[in-house]
């Protein structure tokens, strides 16, 4: 069964800066990745970035830099101030559309006990939805 992992890290240098890393553990080919915050995409969440393996990357504030790390994992740096700034309990979700598995989404947030600059290891997060 495919799995999606999500890792959230607060940068030690800038407390309003977060790095989100997501990956897809499956054998299919990824056709699209959507990163959102505030909940799953399409269920109250707001899209931060869309990554297509061949069409490129689109991102919207407070996303600063989205990129492919490997063919099956991505990273996104967020930085914000005021209303658009993420906070420690913000939920971030990654949805991977793949063929032939379909869509798989998981969410994560900053581990409650983590200090700035630290993060939980990238373990598979609970899968919220498989379309």
């Amino acid at each position: 069964t495919p799995e999606v992992w999500v890792q959230v890290r607060m940068e030690a240098t800038e407390l309003s800066s977060f790095t989100i890393r997501c990956g897809f553990l499956g054998s299919g080919s990824i056709s699209l990745v959507t990163v959102s915050w505030g909940g799953p995409n399409g269920a109250g969440g707001t899209t931060l970035a869309v990554l297509h393996p061949e069409r490129g990357i689109r991102q919207w504030a407070p996303a600063r830099q989205a990129r492919w790390e490997t063919q099956s994992s991505i990273s996104l740096i967020l930085e914000g101030s005021g209303a658009s700034s993420p906070c420690a309990n913000t939920t971030f979700c990654c949805k991977f559309a793949s063929f032939p598995e379909g869509s798989w989404e998981a969410c994560g947030s900053l581990p409650p006990s983590s200090d700035p600059g630290l993060s939980a290891p990238p373990t598979p997060a609970p899968i919220l939805r498989a379309d």
Epitope: E54, R55, W60, R67
Partner: antibody
């Protein structure tokens, strides 16, 4: 099918503003971002910016940051681009295009003339 | 900003001939993470909006005839039409799909003799 509808033409006076519309149909408006592109004869295509209707947040080409303002009205599935302080160099054909530029509107011709 | 330079600016060929046009970018359009080139080609016929032909430097959009082929990597890209048809009369644009702002080339105008 996915369609983007734009009015055919706008005639405006120098120094004024114009608000161009792009009405979307055939898909969920909030899940597909809208780009705006300028075409002047002999000058090629220029990307002005994009806006994601789900978050109302735009990105701008720095060149157009003080010229264009992108907004959306999700209730009518319409994207708008307001152009201000119009001058002759703003006379052009303006297109809206969906997502990764895979669907285009027919374009609106803006003519700035006194 | 990434500058896209196309050549030639125009060319005139007879139906059935093979055509190649070039597009060069001022920075690499290769994504190191997934080894994909973020370059697209568009066809704009007179009086019509642009139409997506090729994305990812070499992937044809669905419905695009297989006489259109995209190739290249990094900063140098080519669009080839293997056997030009009368309906291919158009301006062809390449586009940086890699990073904001999404710059286009100046276009290559294809005329049919």
């Amino acid at each position: 099918q996915v369609q983007l509808q734009q009015p055919g033409a706008e005639l405006v006076k120098p120094g004024t503003s114009v608000k161009l519309s792009c009405k979307a149909s055939g898909y969920q408006f909030t899940s597909y971002w809208i780009n705006w592109v300028k075409l002047r004869p002999g000058q090629g295509l220029e990307w002005i910016g994009d806006i994601y209707p789900g978050s109302y947040i735009p990105n701008y080409n720095e060149k157009f940051k003080n010229k264009a303002t992108l907004t959306v009205d999700t209730s009518s599935s319409t994207a708008y681009m307001q152009l201000t302080s119009l001058a002759s160099e703003d006379s052009a054909l303006y297109y809206c295009a969906g997502g990764y530029f895979d669907v285009w509107g027919a374009g609106t011709t803006v003519t700035v003339s006194s | 900003d990434i500058v896209m330079t196309q050549s030639p600016s125009s060319l005139s060929v007879s139906a059935g001939e093979k055509v190649t046009m070039s597009c060069k970018s001022s920075q690499s359009l290769l994504s190191s993470g997934n080894q994909k080139n973020y370059l697209a080609w568009y066809q704009q016929k007179p009086g019509q909006p642009p139409k997506l032909l090729i994305y990812g430097a070499s992937t044809r959009e669905s419905g695009v005839p297989d006489r259109f082929t995209g190739s290249g990597s990094g900063t140098d890209f080519t669009l080839t039409i293997s056997s030009v048809q009368a309906e291919d009369l158009a301006v062809y644009y390449c586009q940086n799909d890699h990073s904001y702002p999404y710059t286009f080339g100046g276009g290559t105008k294809l005329e049919i003799k």
